[in-house]
């Protein structure tokens, strides 16, 4: 998916009150300093691709994060203000139906949160260069 | 089952407001954005815009941006479409329709409508 | 916004035929087109969503095809019941659009 036409500012917004703090939950008791970023993005589009693909693409060591609460408002997001978005979901969701896993909370996980974190905050200041 | 039930007809003076309530039940209010549609008398159907309680934002057509709000209460899983300023071609039925936002992605339940009248 | 046109506006038809309507898309909008049927006093009712993606409890004479700019509702032998306004609908971005509508009535 090209998220080259989706509604940034209404992403960027979603984001700020509500996403963000989500994502600050479930690192809750973990120290900031604790994971390097090593996932970087250059531009808005770009920082969707990675974010989708950290959220929801099933990695070693940490099965799924797609049920978690900055999930699902991730989904509704980029369903709602990303043109055709939605429709290629349809297909996906029904195969996450199949493969609903309990949630559980790896070190793994914590890492790839942290990643998403620092995606989320280069997608809101996108006019920075990139170090 | 799922039901998406609107308050009465309405009766409104040029000028005034209208407050339109879509009361849901039947399924997980956060799960669907609450979408309004409204259809004049023998006329297409037009949207006006979404409420999204997951994420606690709302989303306009540019045709009525600064008079419709909609809002919803969670709590009691009410959603609500005020249309401010009316005129006579206001005069019309008001829907509320759920949509999913994390899945089925299309607007598969309606409530009955709203028929509000504009007249002096 | 992006403009759907149906066509015909509308199609008198006898029961047992077979009806064919079309909605054309202002621009390319994939498969993100819904198809809905309403009768008089009646809200809307979803038949097919995704283009073609059925429904449950929607007869299996109701079918959906298209992508792109071009979509087609056809139901295959109508039934009395079937004579209505059908309406196409785009969710691929907003303002969310719909067609003009499609009456379908009793030749």
């Known amino acids: 998916y090209d998220f080259t036409n989706c509604d940034f500012e209404k992403i960027k917004a979603a984001y700020l009150s509500t996403i963000s703090k989500d994502l600050i939950t479930y690192m809750s008791g973990t120290k900031s300093t604790e994971f390097n970023n090593t996932v970087s993005c250059s531009n808005r589009p770009h920082c969707l691709t990675e974010i989708q693909s950290l959220t929801f693409n099933p990695t070693a060591g940490c099965a799924s994060l797609a049920k978690e609460m900055f999930a699902m408002k991730t989904k509704a997001a980029l369903a709602i203000w990303c043109p055709g978005y939605s429709e290629t979901q349809i297909n996906a969701t029904q195969a996450m139906k199949k493969a609903r896993k309990s949630k559980v909370t790896t070190n793994k996980c914590l890492e790839q949160v942290s990643q998403l974190q620092g995606l989320w905050r280069r997608f809101n200041r996108p006019l920075l260069k990139q170090q | 089952q799922v039901q998406l039930v609107q308050s009465g007809p309405e009766v409104k003076k040029p000028g005034s407001s209208v407050k339109v309530s879509c009361k849901a039940s039947g399924y997980i209010f956060t799960d669907y954005a609450m979408h309004w549609v409204r259809q004049r008398p023998g006329q297409d159907l037009e949207w006006m815009g979404t409420f999204i309680p997951l994420l606690d934002t709302s989303d306009y057509n540019q045709n009525f941006k600064g008079r419709a709000t909609i809002t919803a209460d969670k709590s009691t899983s009410t959603a609500y479409m005020e249309l401010s300023s009316l005129r006579s071609e206001d005069t019309a039925v008001y829907y509320c329709?759920?949509?999913?936002?994390?899945?089925?992605?299309?607007?598969?339940?309606w409530g009955q409508g709203t028929l509000v009248t504009v007249s002096s | 916004e992006i403009v759907l046109t149906q066509s015909p506006g509308t199609l008198s038809l006898s029961p047992g035929e077979r009806a064919t309507l079309s909605c054309r898309a202002s621009q390319h909008i994939s498969r993100s087109v819904h198809w809905y049927q309403q009768k008089p006093g009646e809200a809307p009712r979803l038949l097919i969503y995704f283009a073609s993606q059925s429904i449950s409890g929607i007869p299996d004479r109701f079918s959906g095809s298209g992508s792109g700019t071009d979509f087609t509702l056809t139901i295959s032998r109508l039934e009395s019941e079937d004579f209505a306004v059908y309406y196409c609908?785009?969710?691929?971005?907003?303002?969310?659009?719909f067609g003009r509508g499609t009456k379908v009535e009793i030749k």
């Open positions: 609908q785009q969710s691929y971005s907003f303002p969310y659009t």
């Open positions: 329709a759920r949509m999913g936002v994390t899945h089925s992605y299309v607007m598969d339940a």
